[in-house]
């Protein structure tokens, strides 16, 4: 059945989302499966339901068990199961495997560690980060929004990283911790200011009225995995999505890796049934990464 494992530590906040997600307007009823007893929605209770979320503020070991959520739309009722386990706090620094979230990998140029499940909570920056129970200090470590960035990652940065934050509910504060392993890949990658391979700047492309045409925006950003690399088209300085012309559609960017190891992205703009007014538009190919933005412009002309 449609179920999801969730876990937490006693005396910490735990918030669980119904594995059966629906639109925000749908009603969600929660039950404790063993007794079929309804979970209250009143916030004065230590355990209460709030739409798609089930909140343990704070959690107790006795809360462990299977919880049923039923999401009700006008025409469909869908059931999910949350398998919740609350563990006693560990006396030592060791974090057992059953409390670990998924492992993430990083490299010298890409070392983001996201704090697991944090999006479920009402928290305010900054996050506290620990490695093997030691608070992280020094300029190499940057707590940014919901993730940690490590500069100049080295192999000995591998280990278990714990994020700690405070969840606020109606003026009351609850502590939350989450731990995941970080491994380091030996990758000699680098990133450069974007280089647009196509189209050439101020290029003109000849097209036939009434025919279909494709424009390819192709840019390279360096070597190896890239932290941020986007390639997109704009029409007269506007996003394609803001330009309500169904004949003109942008394909999702396709990653490409050449034999020389360059990391490149291609994004195709498809124009169906080319019209006269399309010749008046300015088509901008935009390539963006952490170094900055490069723009090449192309126009269409009649064959």
């Amino acid at each position: 059945k449609f179920s999801k494992q969730s876990w937490g530590l006693e005396n910490e906040a735990l918030i669980v989302r119904c594995p059966r997600q629906g639109k925000s307007s749908y009603i969600v009823d929660w039950y404790y499966s063993q007794t079929n007893k309804s979970i209250p929605t009143q916030e004065r209770n230590r355990v209460f339901a709030s739409g798609q979320l089930l909140k343990f503020l704070p959690a107790e070991v006795a809360d462990s068990g299977i919880y049923t959520c039923i999401v009700r739309s006008p025409t469909f009722n869908r059931t999910g199961y949350a398998n919740v386990t609350i563990y006693k706090k560990q006396p030592d620094c060791n974090v057992p495997d059953y409390l670990m979230y998924s492992t993430v990998s990083g490299s010298e140029k890409n070392s983001k560690i996201y704090c697991p499940t944090i999006d479920l909570y009402n928290w305010t920056a900054p996050l506290e980060w620990f490695k093997n129970c030691q608070a992280l200090q020094g300029s190499r470590y940057k707590a940014h929004k919901s993730f940690l960035v490590i500069d100049n990652v080295m192999t000995d940065d591998a280990g278990d990283y714990t994020c700690k934050f405070i969840h606020n509910e109606n003026g009351a504060n609850y502590s939350v911790t989450a731990t995941r392993s970080f491994t380091v890949k030996d990758e000699q990658g680098f990133s450069l200011f974007p280089v647009i391979r196509a189209p050439a700047h101020n290029e003109t492309k000849e097209v036939e009225i009434g025919e279909n045409t494709n424009l390819t925006c192709s840019a390279c950003f360096g070597k190896g995995a890239q932290f941020l690399a986007t390639v997109q088209w704009q029409l007269n300085g506007n996003k394609i999505t803001d330009f309500s012309e169904p004949r003109i559609q942008q394909e999702e960017g396709q990653n490409q890796s050449f034999s020389n190891g360059l990391a490149c992205v291609n994004t195709v703009l498809r124009i169906a049934d080319v019209k006269e007014e399309d010749l008046l538009l300015r088509y901008d190919c935009l390539a963006l990464n952490l170094h900055g933005l490069r723009r090449h412009t192309i126009r269409l002309s009649r064959k």
Epitope: K1, F2, Q21, G22, K23, S73, T75, F76, T79, T241
Partner: antibody
């Protein structure tokens, strides 16, 4: 009452283009994901493409990727399928259908279907 | 891509008999599986969602069961209007896929 009405089908030569439309009524079009599903003569159902309610995410079957483009105009309650570089194997009845549940990146069932429009690709 | 295999391809039965249709997935789809009925010249009609829940307006003689990879659609007592083609569909992930169909015909 939910209604979906496809149009735009017809006979087209291989390599040609066609644009299908699906006019929707009887529900809040802008919040539901919409699908195109096709059925070749005497064959089973094949998912072609889908688009989320706000048009922000589109999905395609491998067999049509790069040739077909799904889009929607929520102000007109209309779903589109632009079909380019058509092949004989694209010959089918094309149905538009509603996914009444799907949330971002997930799918559900198709509870309402149009009557279908026939696309024939032949020289 | 998850492949759904339906069996049998054709089921020849008389009105009043019980029909049992099978759908097997190439990997687990939890209970993210639906059944549709299609009559000649018509669009498919949703019967069952989430493996075992009847859609609005579907008669109680239709029932679904199963979870993971093996699913069954049962029609407890066939009515004349039930003779049609039945498809299963999974929606656990993209792309959604359909089975090849089972035709229930009059014996």
């Amino acid at each position: 009452e939910v209604q979906l009405l496809e149009s735009g089908g017809g006979l087209v030569q291989p390599g040609g283009s066609l644009r299908l439309s699906c006019a929707a009524s009887g529900f809040t079009f802008s919040v539901d994901s919409m699908f195109w599903v096709r059925q070749a003569p005497g064959k089973g159902l094949e998912w072609v493409s889908s688009i989320e309610g706000n048009g922000g995410a589109t999905y395609y079957a491998d067999s049509v990727k790069g040739r077909f483009t799904i889009s929607r105009d929520n102000s007109k309650n209309t779903l589109y399928l632009q079909m380019n570089s058509l092949r004989a194997e694209d010959t089918a009845v094309y149905y538009c259908a509603r996914d009444p549940w799907s949330t971002e990146g997930s799918f559900f069932v198709l509870d309402y279907w149009g009557q279908g429009t026939l696309v024939t690709v032949s020289s | 891509e998850i492949v759904l295999t339906q069996s049998p391809a054709t089921l020849s039965l008389s009105p009043g008999e019980r029909a049992t249709l099978s759908c097997r997935a190439s990997q687990s789809v939890d209970d993210d599986l639906a059944w549709y009925q299609q009559k000649p010249g018509q669009a498919p009609r949703l019967l069952i969602y989430d493996a075992s829940n009847r859609a609005t307006g579907i008669p109680a003689r239709f029932s679904g069961s199963g979870s993971g990879t093996d699913f069954t659609l049962t029609i407890s007592s066939l009515e004349p209007e039930d003779f049609a083609v039945y498809y299963c569909q999974q929606y656990i992930g993209a792309p959604i896929t359909f089975g090849q169909g089972t035709k229930v015909e009059i014996k």
